[in-house]
């Protein structure tokens, strides 16, 4: 080093990647979702990619149809293995209605509270999986805005199976589920042709969720 070398200013160290995320998965459990084991297979493949723990990523699951159930809270399990066991046991609760706005709003207001394990200053992520237009569509815009106001990153997944089986147009449905996703939509919205195809998006979805850790 040259004798004239001197430190003129100090550079802040490169920020470490945070491994902390609070993720709530919001599952449509209405009767039109079939087969349910395709949903549990999707959960299994997604969750086994996560480093779950009280100081790492936490995961909670909410299921909705006509009403909403907290399957488990963010702080319920402290390892990936425990969460995988619990997720496999989630039973489809059914219902003839798809109250997506209610599901999302309940996740925001309840699942992301400190009482249920949400951590201050930790990035909030919501993954919404549904196969049909919501029956409470009129509430959706406000519910999404409330999530936006609370900086909840949203990934939405549209399962087109029921529409394809009924030869119905998917246009309105896709439009609705796209509206749920955070911007940019093309990075936060997914659609699959049928329930069994859910597992095919796990790798990409996982990568995009983990990319949030670095931001």
């Amino acid at each position: 080093v040259s004798p004239t070398f001197q430190v003129v200013n100090s550079i802040a160290p490169v920020q470490e990647c945070s491994t902390q995320l609070d993720i709530v998965i919001v599952l449509d459990g209405s009767n039109s979702i079939y087969p349910w084991d395709s949903v549990t297979a999707f959960l299994n493949d997604l969750l086994e990619r996560m480093d779950i723990g009280p100081k790492q990523t936490q995961v909670g699951i909410v299921q909705y149809g006509e009403n909403v159930t907290h399957e488990f809270n963010l702080n319920k399990y402290s390892s990936t293995e425990e969460v995988l066991v619990a997720a496999k046991k989630i039973v489809q609760r059914g219902g003839r209605q798809t109250m997506t706005a209610l599901g999302i709003d309940t996740a925001r207001k309840e699942a992301f509270t400190e009482a249920r394990g949400a951590r201050r200053g930790v990035k909030k992520v919501m993954v919404i999986v549904t196969d049909g237009e919501s029956h409470d569509n009129h509430r959706l815009k406000k519910v999404i805005q409330d999530c936006e106001d609370e900086n909840i990153q949203r990934f939405s997944i549209a399962i087109l199976g029921s529409y394809n089986r009924g030869n119905l147009s998917t246009e309105k449905f896709v439009e609705e589920i796209k509206s749920i996703a955070s911007e940019p939509t093309e990075k936060h919205f997914f659609n699959v042709s049928d329930e069994l195809a859910l597992v095919t998006i796990v790798k990409t979805l996982g990568e995009r969720i983990f990319a949030l850790e670095a931001t």
């Epitope: 039109s32 046991k89 049909g132 029921s162 030869n167 069994l196 195809a197």
Partner: antibody
């Protein structure tokens, strides 16, 4: 009325691959899940796996590594391949349709396997 | 996986009698996804009941299903000669599994 017919060799050598086809007549293969089930002589029923008309599949975790399923919508057929067979795979193999009905719009109600093939006996020897 | 246990293994009854078959699941099953099948020797199974209690098309009303959660029952109110067969329950909410079967035989 939808009818299903299984076809394939009745005898397969150990370690080889069992291949069966199910032909759907009297209706379209589209928009349904289609399953394979087997039954060893004098025993109960075991689900092997299912294929959707789009080609998506899932299968029994205990057989997953050996099972391949596919669908040919042009021929109205779906097929099963089971690799590395042993004598324990000797059974009657059935194909079946997973039935559903619509309540309204896209709300379909599933009701299990409503149409079955008559079954085909496969012996591994 | 969800294990289904059927009892009794064999039921010996006379025509005209009432048959009650039980199916117990190792964990809760959505009642939307429990079915009953009848199988006669040399034949494929036939769907009798779906959604725990709904009769499939063409099934006579002497067959009825009930139950929820982990306990389900198939009842045949008055046995006809053609009802003597093996009966299987099946759950189709989480990777299809079948019970071991109950054989209803003539006493």
């Amino acid at each position: 009325q939808v009818q299903l017919q299984e076809s394939g060799p009745g005898l397969v050598k150990p370690s080889e691959t069992l291949s069966l086809t199910c032909t759907v007549s009297g209706g379209s293969i589209s928009s349904h899940y289609w399953s394979w089930i087997r039954q060893p002589a004098g025993k109960g029923l075991e689900w092997i796996g299912r294929v959707y008309s789009s080609g998506s599949t899932n299968s029994n975790p205990s057989l997953k590594s050996r099972v391949t399923m596919s669908v040919d919508t042009a021929k109205n057929q779906f097929s099963l391949k089971l690799s590395s067979v042993t004598a324990a795979d000797t059974a009657v193999y059935y194909c079946a349709r997973e039935g559903y009905d619509f309540w309204s719009d896209y709300y379909n109600y599933y009701y299990g396997m409503d149409v079955w093939g008559q079954g085909t006996t496969v012996t591994v020897s | 996986e969800i294990v289904l246990t059927q009892s009794p293994g064999t039921l010996s009854l006379s025509p005209g009698e009432r048959a009650t078959l039980s199916c117990r699941a190792s964990q809760s099953v959505s009642s939307s996804y429990l079915a009953w099948y009848q199988q006669k020797p040399g034949q494929a199974p036939r769907l009798l009941i779906y959604g725990a209690s709904s009769r499939a098309t063409g099934i006579p009303d002497r067959f009825s299903g009930s139950g929820s959660g982990t306990d389900f029952t198939l009842t045949i109110s008055r046995l006809e000669p053609e009802d003597f067969a093996v009966y299987y329950c099946q759950q189709y909410g989480s990777a299809f599994t079948f019970g071991g079967g109950t054989k209803v035989e003539i006493k």
